[in-house]
């Protein structure tokens, strides 16, 4: 059994999150993850989910009673999601820490926008996609 | 030329982001994107970048002078990053809108943690990885 399981059970007690009523009104993440089978689609969604958990854990960083559990889970997330690559994790953290209200950050983001957009689609590397592909489908 | 280019140039003027001094102290996004060639790694990073831009645009939603530019760029992001798939974009938006300080959201997130973790690594779908694969690499 992976180390995170025991520690996640510990967090469930702490957050009173073991009761069946917690599942009322649907899931946060599981339903969405079910929708996406493609690895690249899953990474788009999981990126947001992982950053949510990191933010949540940061909010409870001073609570000693769950420190060990939080650290173990974060470590296991590093292994599973970042494939144990510290550089990948560090780059991710940088992105999550940029402040959207910082004027210098805003200017930089807009300055880089055209190049960021040019790289967004996988097709960007293999030539330009036809405009006919560019409708919005549901 | 994609429609976003002209509109991004318009935003550069609005944000005074065209000057060379904006590039001082390194890039926000471009340097990080250079580090990752694998499509799934790129999606992890781009997911954070796109959510940053959406948040930034939301902060300026009442500014009429850049409304058209913002809308055009968002539309092009939908095409390029979400492959024009509205369901994908909607699921993404849901994830970015969850409040980390909402007690019900916290409980749900912890309730789902074990299952989310089990799905994090690509290998999760093809059987359990050997423990020897689970080291932390730099």
């Amino acid at each position: 059994q992976d180390p995170y399981v025991k520690e996640a059970e510990n967090l469930k007690k702490y957050f009173n999150a073991g009761h069946s009523d917690v599942a009322d009104n649907g899931t946060l993440f599981l339903g969405i993850l079910k929708n996406w089978k493609e690895e690249s689609d899953r990474k788009i969604m999981q990126s947001q989910i992982v950053s949510f958990y990191f933010k949540l854990f940061k909010n409870f960083k001073d609570d000693q009673s769950i420190q060990k559990s939080v650290e173990t889970i974060k470590e296991d997330m590093n292994v599973k999601f970042f494939n144990s690559n510290k550089k990948k994790r560090d780059d991710f953290e940088k992105l999550t820490n940029y402040s959207v209200t910082d004027l210098n950050v805003q200017r930089k983001a807009i300055h880089e926008l055209i190049q960021v957009m040019a790289e967004l689609s996988p097709a960007a590397k293999t030539g330009k996609r036809k405009r006919s592909q560019m409708l919005f489908r549901g | 030329q994609d429609p976003y280019v002209k509109e991004a140039e318009n935003l550069k003027k609005y944000f005074n982001a065209g000057h060379s001094d904006v590039a001082d102290n390194g890039t926000l996004f471009l340097g990080i994107l250079k580090n990752w060639k694998e499509e799934s790694d790129r999606k992890i990073m781009q997911s954070q970048i796109v959510s940053f831009y959406f948040k930034l645009f939301k902060n300026f939603k009442d500014d009429q002078s850049i409304q058209k530019s913002v809308e055009t760029i968002k539309e092009d992001m939908n095409v390029k990053f979400f492959n024009s798939n509205k369901k994908k974009r909607d699921d993404f938006e849901k994830l970015t809108n969850y409040s980390v300080t909402d007690l019900n959201v916290q409980r749900k997130a912890i309730h789902e943690l074990i299952q989310v973790m089990a799905e994090l690594s690509p290998a999760a779908k093809t059987g359990k990885r050997k423990r020897s694969q689970m080291l932390f690499r730099g």
Epitope: P3, S84, K86, K87 | F136, R137, G138
Partner: antibody, heavy 123, light 111 residues
């Protein structure tokens, strides 16, 4: 100040065994992954083995897999390397090294290093 | 497994600048951190650069690290060479399959 002190090296015949120890002080030992790196006389550095802070995960270079065992005793702040079926090519100075940053299962860089202990495998 | 290839030796005069290269044979140099260690004769290695370009406290700013993705090469640059910089220098990175790789080492001679 972080200190790492290796011991247990010496002369051993091919096929023999040795157990190296590394006594650590000046940091929270259990929070850091630890490694053994060796250096044959006049040669470069070679990573040998690593272990997570808890001791739950261990990793080996192909050249020593099945012969060497890394372990740690966090209550004694000590790292070990049990070396069996020793060969002439295992002759080297063996360094113990701490991970450069905490909170990772294994090191991504090595800092600091101990002074090393010399293992000589010869008949 | 990839290899990290360094020049066997480099030499330069005091006060000058020297660059030691470390080329990754396969896989991208930018996708894992690169470290540099200095080893003086008879001593254990010490870190001079970690995480591509960061300097541990106590290491002078004459030492700098850089990465060039186009040549798949990491470089250690030492400016204002001093006699005490004479040593062996090793680059190190993760190999992508649970192993840590070292370059073969470069002997720096200060003339």
């Amino acid at each position: 100040e972080v200190q790492l002190l290796e011991s247990g090296g010496g002369l051993v015949q091919p096929g023999g065994s040795l157990r190296l120890s590394c006594a650590a002080s000046g940091f929270t030992f259990s929070s850091y992954a630890m490694s053994w790196v060796r250096q044959a006389p006049g040669k470069g550095l070679e990573w040998v083995s690593a272990i997570s802070g808890s001791g739950g995960s261990t990793y080996y270079a192909d050249s020593v897999k099945g012969r060497f065992t890394i372990s740690r005793d966090n209550s004694k702040n000590t790292l070990y390397l049990q070396m069996n079926s020793l060969r002439a090519e295992d002759t080297a100075v063996y360094y113990c090294a701490k991970d450069g940053s905490s909170g990772w299962y294994v090191p991504h860089w090595f800092d600091p290093w101990g002074r090393g202990t010399l293992v000589t495998v010869s008949s | 497994n990839f290899m990290l290839t360094q020049p066997h030796s480099v030499s330069e005069s005091p006060g000058k600048t020297v660059t030691i290269s470390c080329t990754r044979s396969s896989g991208s140099i930018v996708s894992n951190y690169v470290q540099w260690y200095q080893q003086r004769p008879g001593s254990a290695p010490t870190t001079v650069i970690y995480e591509d370009n960061r300097r541990p406290s106590g290491v002078p700013d004459r030492f700098s690290g850089s990465i060039d993705s186009s040549s798949n090469t990491a470089s250690l640059t030492i400016s204002g060479l001093e006699a005490e910089d004479e040593a062996d220098y090793y680059c190190q990175s993760y190999d992508g399959s649970n192993r840590w790789m070292f370059g073969g080492g470069t002997k720096l001679t200060v003339l």
